[in-house]
């Protein structure tokens, strides 16, 4: 909707700005149960390796960076947690921190483009819902407008 | 792996040139239902919009495209395949030739980039869980890392 | 009820330029394909362009192409045919028409003459 | 491009009357064929796609049919007001193209 796509563009008129503040809080919240943590590591290899930043940085960032989020708030916050009743709550505080920070990248869509959805795609579904049966015979009967666009975006990837 | 890396760029390199006969391969086999659907079809708007179009053309591109695919492999298709006995088979043949497209888009990672996993992602969660409980103090301890990794993204970001 | 109205028709001399333009009211205009379709003076019907829903995808006959460009305005739901290096033989009623996006002319305007002559 | 060829310009008829008109494509058109009623002073109106699918508000009187190469409009009763020049044309590939159209004119 309209509405949303000028929250969207206000979101990333300032998310520049925002982003030392976010980090900034995202290390406070860290610095809290890093030393719990980083004593009971008692190995001295990386789990996060460069080629992570390299993955980062490449055509699969927005994966890669989507899937670390989801991989620390969903396997190791939770986990975390439960190691003491003393950290439970900074560990918390630090989640609550990463969501904060992927709601704001997902509001500004082209800091994480590969978590939206197309709105294009609903509105054809939804249509397709509508129409019942009469929208097997729409989407099948424009194939071809389907092989048109499929056309376009490789063109456009092949040219980019 | 490293094998896995040459035949993506192998697929890479000769995609270009199989690109106008795979359409020209989908094309042929929408033709040989195109007049069964289009006769069935009695309203005169357009389903596939093209807001659509600007989708695929658009930072969502490959969201987009991967959802249409879906769409019509998983909803329309299957749907489409019962109207009648006669058009099972190249309805069938449509879908299997759609699918081919997917598979070439997906070796040749540049188009269909959303679709593929980050392997270093891959390679921390496998990591991760050799580790057992001592991943949990691992993956919390380099929280820092992760956090400049986080912000070389965003800078990229916002540099591009 | 669907209409369509064709303007911009008049009398122009050969080797010269016109545009015409058809409003369209009564439908979501960018949820249709639509098309220009001639009628010469001994009354056969001629295709002339086709534009896609959003102006991205314009198709023409061999007889038009080069020297005719279909255009739409979605926002003001106007449809365009710019004519230029004009021949006598382009003479005809030009009519505006939605329809399925494969060429089948569902709902017809009444027309604009276009007479070219020295 | 397709040729459609329609044999009669003219073909007379009495009201009341059955009358078929004919048409006939160059090549296969996989019943891509529409067929157009154009009244004296009007705009061409859209009777019948894909061979024999009747558009929305056209009377039952009003059928189409053949495949492959062959068409026809049949009017099972002709009525005064169905006075009008008839084209088909075909719509199962570009250039979309007409026939050169039947005028029907009651005795």
């Known amino acids: 909707s309209p509405g949303q796509g000028t929250q969207s563009e206000n979101s990333c008129t300032h998310f520049p700005g925002n982003l030392p503040n976010m980090l900034r809080d995202l290390r406070d919240a860290f610095s809290r149960v890093k030393t719990f943590f980083q004593m009971k590591d008692q190995l001295d290899n990386l789990l996060l390796k460069e080629s992570l930043l390299e993955d980062f940085k490449g055509y699969l960032g927005c994966q890669a960076l989507s899937e670390m989020i989801q991989f620390y708030l969903e396997e190791v916050m939770p986990q975390a947690e439960n190691q003491d009743p003393d950290i439970k709550a900074h560990v918390n505080s630090l989640g609550e921190n990463l969501k904060t920070l992927r709601l704001r990248l997902r509001r500004c869509h082209r800091f994480l483009p590969c978590e939206n959805k197309s709105k294009a795609v609903e509105q054809v579904k939804n249509a397709f819902n509508k129409l019942q049966e009469k929208g097997i015979y729409k989407a099948m009967s424009e194939f071809d407008i389907f092989i048109n666009y499929i056309e376009a975006y490789m063109t456009m990837k092949i040219r980019n | 792996s490293p094998g896995q890396g040459t035949q993506s760029e192998n697929s890479c390199t000769h995609f270009p040139g199989n690109l106008p006969n795979m359409l020209r391969d989908l094309r042929d086999a929408f033709s040989r239902v195109k007049t069964f659907f289009q006769m069935k079809d009695q309203l005169d708007n357009l389903l596939l919009k093209e807001s659509l179009l600007e989708d695929f053309k658009g930072y969502l591109g490959c969201q987009a495209l991967s959802e249409m695919i879906q769409f019509y492999l998983e909803e329309v298709m299957p749907q489409a395949e019962n109207q009648d006995p006669d058009i099972k088979a190249h309805v069938n043949s449509l879908g299997e030739n759609l699918k081919t497209l997917r598979l070439r888009l997906r070796r040749c990672h540049r188009f269909l980039p959303c679709e593929n996993k980050s392997k270093a992602v891959e390679q921390v969660k496998n990591a991760f869980n050799k580790l057992q409980e001592k991943g949990i103090y691992k993956a919390m301890s380099e929280f820092d890392i992760f956090i400049n990794y986080i912000e070389a993204y965003m800078t990229m970001k916002i540099r591009n | 009820e669907v209409q369509l109205v064709e303007s911009g028709g008049g009398l122009v001399k050969p080797g010269g330029s016109l545009k015409l333009s058809c409003a369209a009211s009564g439908f979501t205009f960018s949820d249709y394909y639509m098309y220009w379709v001639r009628q010469t003076p001994e009354k056969r019907l001629e295709w002339v362009a086709t534009i896609s829903d959003g102006g991205s995808y314009t198709y023409y006959p061999d007889s038009v192409k080069g020297r005719f460009t279909i255009s739409r305005d979605n926002a003001k739901n106007n449809l365009y045919l710019q004519m230029s290096s004009l021949k006598s033989e382009d003479t005809a009623m030009f009519y505006c028409a939605r329809g399925y996006y494969y060429g089948l002319f569902t709902y017809w305007g009444q027309g604009t003459l276009v007479t070219v002559s020295a | 491009d397709i040729v459609m060829t329609q044999s009669h310009k003219f073909m007379s008829t009495s009201v009341g009357d059955r009358v078929s008109i004919t048409c006939k494509a160059s090549?296969?058109?996989?019943?891509?064929v529409a067929w157009y009623q154009q009244k004296p002073g009007q705009s061409p109106k859209l009777l019948i796609y894909?061979?024999?699918t009747r558009h929305t508000g056209v009377p039952d009187r009003f059928t189409g049919s053949g495949s492959g190469t062959d068409y026809i409009l049949t009017i099972s009763s002709v009525q005064a007001e169905d006075l009008a020049l008839y084209y088909c044309q075909q719509h199962y590939s570009t250039p979309y193209t007409f026939g050169g159209g039947t005028k029907l004119e009651i005795k």
């Open positions: 894909w061979a024999s």
């Open positions: 090549q296969d058109v996989n019943t891509g």
